[in-house]
Interface confidence: low
């Protein structure tokens, strides 16, 4: 069972939010869908096949940033009915290609700041147990991806974390993995890929909303980042 990275996005009534999603590869349909209560299916909200769900027309935009391996979905004129569970994804099958779960909460008043809210203790960067150790669910490989930085990156194969010559195509804003080669042995953590844009964002410390100049209100943080499949984000 693949456990999706999960992020929480909060916005104010009438405001807007930007949802950041991993862009696994070029030339594939990408989408944001909304999970339907009861049915368990995920209905497309917006996709690159020019589909926009009726109730989002005129207030949703999808922008691709292929060099950053990232796509953004902005939803404006937020209403309380926009609150719910969404998912980013890639591929022709909306239900099967999900790469990230997004919980959107639209509220009428915005709390002052992250700092003024009681927050659970955030894990320390150096003390997360799976940073430099083999987790129980990891493969037997003892190599970590060693990434080099060619000026231009061609399309490369998907991530297969069982190989010591892992290739990574994903490079969202937060994670600058680009192409190739596993030439030096190191402790290997195969549980995540560089595609975890939103699972990484806000991972270690909550953000203040002011950083996002695209939206009036935007907070996005990781809820779960410990059990992700090495092939997530591949669609």
């Amino acid at each position: 069972l693949r456990i999706l990275p999960e992020v929480k996005v909060e916005g104010e009534l009438g405001g807007s939010v930007t949802i950041k999603c991993p862009l696994p590869e070029m030339h594939v349909r990408i989408y944001l869908c909304r999970e339907m209560a009861g049915s368990g299916t995920c209905g497309t909200v917006v996709s690159t096949t020019n589909f926009i769900k009726a109730e989002y027309k005129g207030r949703v935009t999808l922008k691709q940033y292929p060099r950053k391996n990232l796509f953004l979905v902005e939803v404006t004129q937020l209403t309380e009915s926009d609150s719910g569970v969404y998912a980013c994804g890639a591929g022709m099958n909306t239900d099967r290609g999900k790469t990230q779960k997004v919980t959107l909460n639209v509220h009428s008043e915005y709390e002052p700041s992250w700092e003024e809210q009681p927050m659970p203790e955030t894990p320390k960067w150096f003390h997360l147990p799976y940073l430099f150790q083999m987790p129980a669910y990891a493969s037997s490989s003892k190599f970590v991806t060693r990434v080099t930085t060619p000026a231009q990156r061609g399309k490369v194969p998907p991530v297969h974390h069982s190989s010591p010559t892992t290739q990574i195509t994903h490079r969202p804003r937060v994670s600058r993995a680009s192409s190739v080669a596993g030439d030096k042995p190191r402790t290997f953590l195969p549980s995540t890929t560089a595609s975890k844009i939103s699972a990484l964002e806000g991972l270690l410390k909550p953000q203040t909303p002011s950083y996002n100049h695209h939206t009036r209100l935007h907070r996005q943080r990781a809820l779960d980042y410990g059990s992700q499949s090495g092939r997530e984000g591949q669609g």
Epitope: Y65, R67, K68, T122, P123, K124, W125, F126, L128, Y130, L131, F132, V144, T145, R146, V147, T149, A151, R153, I168, R171, R173, V174, S175, R176, A177, S178, R186, T187, F188, L189, P190, S191, T192, T193, A194, K196, L200, E201, G202, L203, L204, K205, P206, Q207, T208, Y211, N212, H213, Y225
Partner: antibody, heavy 124, light 105 residues
């Protein structure tokens, strides 16, 4: 607030290696990644590589991909950068910096906290 | 590749100066500006092309998007005389401009 404390000056002979360190203190929970940037005397800044912990991936500038190795020691909250096959052109000040592209400073995507720098001299 | 201009600049206290940074290809707004004084580590001034880093005086103004960016310092103060670098974080391999040395006239 995070502080990055770097090790002392180093002198090495051509062909040898140097290992420089960068110890994080303070609010290490706000560190998303650490980059290494160097500056030769009278020259500009040159990014060498970075380590980001989740997932544990090291990324290197092409120029350094065969000679640089960045590692981290969780027990001491220290990041290391090893540079091998040194030549006189590697004489420089080596800085570590918080690579502010995740965690609390996602939007910045910049180096906002720097170590004080380590002077590495390569001379025969 | 980032190209800064001018590479050297003389000005007087109270002047307004502009430093430009041109990217060989679009870097969107992933462009940062740093100030460095002799013997010191660089200091982040502007991130994301135009956002002022916390604690930096408002006389530092960044603008631009795509390939052309500017750093303007209005009403120069004595402590502003330093070297300024632009840096892009759009591509995997971060790069810096050559630097602009701002000297007192």
């Amino acid at each position: 607030q995070v502080q990055l404390q770097q090790s002392g000056a180093e002198v090495r002979k051509p062909g040898s290696s140097v290992n420089v360190s960068c110890k994080a203190s303070g609010d290490t929970s706000s560190i998303y990644a650490i980059s290494w940037v160097r500056q030769a005397p009278g020259q500009g800044l040159e990014w060498m590589g970075r380590i980001n912990p989740i997932p544990r991936i090291t990324t290197y500038a092409q120029k350094f991909q065969d000679r640089a190795t960045i590692t981290a020691d969780i027990s001491t909250s220290t990041v290391y950068m090893d540079l091998s096959s040194l030549t006189s052109e590697d004489t420089a000040v080596y800085y570590c910096a918080r690579d502010c592209s995740g965690g609390s400073c996602f939007r910045q995507d910049a180096f906002d906290i720097w170590g004080q720098g380590i002077m590495v001299t390569v001379s025969s | 590749i980032l190209s800064q201009a001018p590479l050297s600049l003389s000005a007087s206290i109270g002047d307004s100066v502009t430093i430009t940074c041109r990217a060989s290809q679009s870097v969107s707004d992933y462009l940062n500006w740093y100030q460095q004084k002799p013997g010191k580590a660089p200091k982040l001034l502007i991130y994301a092309a135009s956002s002022l880093q916390s604690g930096v005086p408002s006389r530092f103004i960044g603008s631009g998007s795509g390939t052309d960016f500017t750093l303007t310092i209005s009403s120069l103060q004595p402590e502003d005389f330093a070297t300024y670098y632009c840096q892009q974080s759009y591509t995997t391999a971060y790069t810096f401009g050559q630097g602009t040395k701002l000297e007192i006239q």
